[in-house]
Interface confidence: medium
């Protein structure tokens, strides 16, 4: 007996053998699926599906909602379909009013017809308003009307499906198009503060603001170089269409030193990503660091001004500042101000303005500052440079001539003899004795020097000059001598004290 090789399996046959069938409302729908391996009938319209395991599908009284695609499937998974229109003059459109469109994509207005023989199947604006000029659509009686390349401007557009039935225009229920925007830029991210400085145990809270066109933007706080999931809270707001804002707040209720580091707020959408960082520094205790803006040893000339300036870092903020001299606190002449008005500022400046300083006002000037955790201070040693002043010039009973001068820096005393009536004293005389009188006294006052020469060395009439000088200037005093026979006489009443010109020395 010859063997018969079976052919390829074929799809089922449907009776009536048409691709489309029009049935009047109230009439019967009778569809027969012919296939030895029949499995089921499936009916689909909009989001509705029904199944029937009988090979004959019978709907005794057809309704408009029976319009749709009827598919017969066999055991090989092959199928055949017929589309049935149930013509109902009272219900021209089947509608699913949910209408979402993704920007730049096509979207389907789901209003399939129950009568394929109507004309002018199209979209119309609500209340007679025209559709946007650039709106393009493609009608399909079995599916609805496809809007091509949805624009953001179509959001909240109200429209109807429309068709002419027996010369009259019929409108479907209204549709409101909701446009889901496409991401065309990376999210905009910002942070409440770029850096935070806290003490251990204080709360760290930082807010990242993410702005984008829709809420499907992704955002998270991350710790740099760490995979640990951070605890964050979200606030979110729609500030109108396509204007979405989210606030992601990261909180560490009791910060520890090892929480210090860089925290990144990261956001992304389908277009790309963006991030912003903030730095946290946690210290176990507050601190103050003082930086002198001038040398702490200051030399200033008599009568001149000087400003003592410090910059300092203080965290927490400084509570008490003062300038002190000789155990006295300045109530004026100083100012203290933040280096910047930035909320995160920890740097401050303090200035003490000393004016027309006298020789007696040298000494230690101290700046003290404190906050709730620590105290700190810095001292300036101020030396006032003064021209020598000759305090005394005498002929002692033992025949010595003595000159005492004071000034800062320490004066040097030189002696000169002028024979006769010469005005220029050039011959220098070596002193017998030189002493610094107050070297062990206060360190910042004028220094007193005493110098003596032996007057018995002078054999002629003349003048003796005592000249005291330092870096600032010089001062001279004179002793006049006259010989009467063999007696030498110092003429005190006519002794001249003539300050000479002095020069300033600036440091």
């Amino acid at each position: 007996q010859p063997s018969v090789s079976p052919g390829e399996p074929s799809p089922p046959s449907i009776h009536p053998a048409k691709s489309e069938l029009i049935v009047r409302v109230g009439n019967e729908i009778r569809l027969l699926c012919i296939d030895p391996g029949f499995v089921k009938w499936t009916f689909e319209i909009l989001d509705e599906t029904n199944e029937n395991k009988q090979n004959e599908w019978i709907t005794e009284k057809a309704e408009a909602t029976n319009t749709g695609k009827y598919t017969c499937t066999n055991k090989h998974g092959l199928s055949s379909s017929i589309y049935v229109f149930v013509r109902d003059p009272a219900k021209l459109f089947l509608v699913d009013r949910s209408l979402y469109g993704k920007e730049d994509n096509d979207t389907l207005v789901r209003c399939p017809l129950t009568d394929p023989e109507v004309t002018s199947y199209s979209l119309k604006g609500c209340q007679g308003k025209p559709l946007p000029k650039d709106l393009r659509f493609v009608p399909d009686p079995k599916a609805g009307i496809t809007i091509k390349s949805v624009k953001r401007a179509y959001h909240r557009l109200c429209l109807h499906c429309s068709a002419d039935q027996e010369g009259k225009s019929v409108l479907s229920d209204k549709f409101i198009l909701k446009v889901r925007p496409a991401f065309k830029a990376v999210p905009v991210v910002s942070v409440s503060k770029a850096s935070y400085l806290l003490r251990e145990g204080e709360e760290f809270t930082v807010t990242c603001t993410i702005k984008d066109v829709s809420s499907s933007v992704y955002s998270t706080w991350k710790r740099e170089n760490s995979q640990t999931k951070l605890q964050e809270k979200y606030n979110s707001w729609h500030h109108g269409d396509f204007n979405y804002e989210r606030q992601a707040t990261l909180t560490i209720s009791s910060a520890r030193v090892n929480d210090s580091g860089v925290f990144m707020c990261y956001a992304n959408n389908t277009f790309g990503s963006a991030n912003v960082t903030t730095t946290l520094e946690v210290v176990d205790k507050g601190f103050i660091n003082i930086f002198p803006m001038i040398n702490t040893t200051v030399f200033v000339n008599d009568g001149e001004n000087v400003d003592l300036i410090v910059e300092y870092e203080a965290f927490p903020k400084p509570e008490h500042q003062q300038w002190i001299y000789m155990n006295r606190t300045f109530t004026d002449k100083w100012e203290d101000y933040p280096k910047s008005e930035n909320e995160s500022n920890i740097r401050y400046v303090s200035e003490l303005h000393l004016t027309r300083l006298k020789g007696t006002e040298g000494g230690t000037y101290t700046f003290l500052v404190s906050n709730s955790d620590v105290n700190a201070s810095i001292a300036f040693n101020v030396y006032v440079n003064t021209k020598p002043e000759i305090l005394t010039y005498d002929r002692l009973v033992n025949g010595m001539l003595q000159c005492v001068a004071a000034g800062f820096p320490e004066p040097t005393i030189d002696w000169y003899f002028c024979p006769g009536t010469e005005q220029r004293c050039s011959a220098s005389v070596l002193p017998v004795d030189v002493q610094t009188l107050n070297a062990s006294g206060p360190p910042f006052g004028k220094l007193v020097v005493q110098s003596s020469i032996d007057s018995s060395a002078f054999k002629h009439n003349g003048t003796v000059e005592c000249k005291a000088y330092n870096d600032v200037g010089k001062t001279s005093a004179y002793f006049n001598f006259a010989f009467k026979g063999n007696n030498k006489e110092q003429i005190h009443p006519h002794t001249l004290f003539t300050p000479r010109s002095h020069h300033h020395h600036h440091h």
């Epitope: 979200y234 729609h238 500030h239």
Partner: antibody, heavy 123, light 108 residues
Framework: QVQLVQSGAEVKKPGESLKISCKGS????????IAWVRQMPGKGLEWMGI????????LYSPSFQGQVTISADKSISTAYLQWSSLKASDTAMYYC????????????????WGQGTLVTVSS | DIELTQPPSVSVSPGQTASITCSGD??????ASWYQQKPGQAPVLVIY???KRPSGIPERFSGSNSGNTATLTISGTQAEDEADYYC??????????FGGGTKLTVLG
């Protein structure tokens, strides 16, 4: 001080329309959202929707979308809740409540409430 | 939408601590607030941003929120605290939702 004063009680028949109001004072009305909250007799609070008076941007709870309309007139610092066709099931106390703006530390709390408007719908 | 579940009632003796819970899927990731409503009155905010108290609210009211549960705690409960309490959260889409409410009864 901040105050939200609501319009008086209403008795209506099914199918009638209604518009109730909520007037804000003592703060910048345009910068705070106004929410509407329903409380049916003996029941809990239900959030209906919210409006930002500055630009009249509204958001509705899915349960109330299409059932009511929320609006505002910033020139008179007043928000409104309206129905085009009342049903017996709309009988309830309706509260308006102020919601601080997005950047506020107290978001999203309803920090001040009106005294409520009782709406009774009965044939 | 998020659903919030509260116990219908909680009873407490005067001076004792009352805890009212509010559970919902991952509500710890958003802020919770709590409202007190006495009969015939409008609700009053008692806790916002999980654990912050508005001015004028006694210190005995406190809140917490993590995981799937927010909790309102009233320590040293007083007779005047007897009321209905509602929790509320607002989701990413800015839709707010209230819990079903808890009737707090102060015994005695």
């Amino acid at each position: 001080q901040v105050q939200l004063v609501q319009s008086g009680a209403e008795v209506k028949k099914p199918g009638e329309s209604l518009k109730i109001s909520c007037k804000g004072s003592g703060y910048s009305f345009t910068n705070y959202w106004i929410a509407w909250v329903r409380q049916m007799p003996g029941k809990g609070l239900e959030w209906m929707g919210i409006i930002y008076p500055s630009n009249s941007y509204t958001l509705y709870s899915p349960s109330f979308q299409g059932q009511v309309t929320i609006s505002a007139d910033k020139s008179i610092s007043t928000a409104y809740l309206q129905w085009s066709s009342l049903k017996a099931s709309d009988t309830a106390m309706y509260y308006c409540a102020r919601v601080p703006p997005g950047g506020s530390i107290s978001y999203p709390a309803f920090d001040h409430w009106g005294q409520g408007t009782l709406v009774t719908v009965s044939s | 939408d998020i659903e919030l579940t509260q116990p219908p009632s909680v009873s407490v003796s005067p001076g004792q601590t009352a805890s009212i819970t509010c559970s919902g899927d991952n509500i710890g990731s958003i802020y919770a607030s709590w409202y007190q409503q006495k009969p015939g009155q409008a609700p009053v905010l008692v806790i916002y941003r999980d654990n912050k108290r508005p001015s004028g609210i006694p210190e005995r009211f406190s809140g917490s929120n993590s995981g799937n549960t927010a909790t309102l705690t009233i320590s040293g409960t007083q007779a005047e605290d007897e009321a209905d309490y509602y929790c509320s959260v607002t989701d990413m889409e800015q839709h707010s939702v209230f819990g079903g409410g808890t009737k707090l009864t102060v015994l005695g």
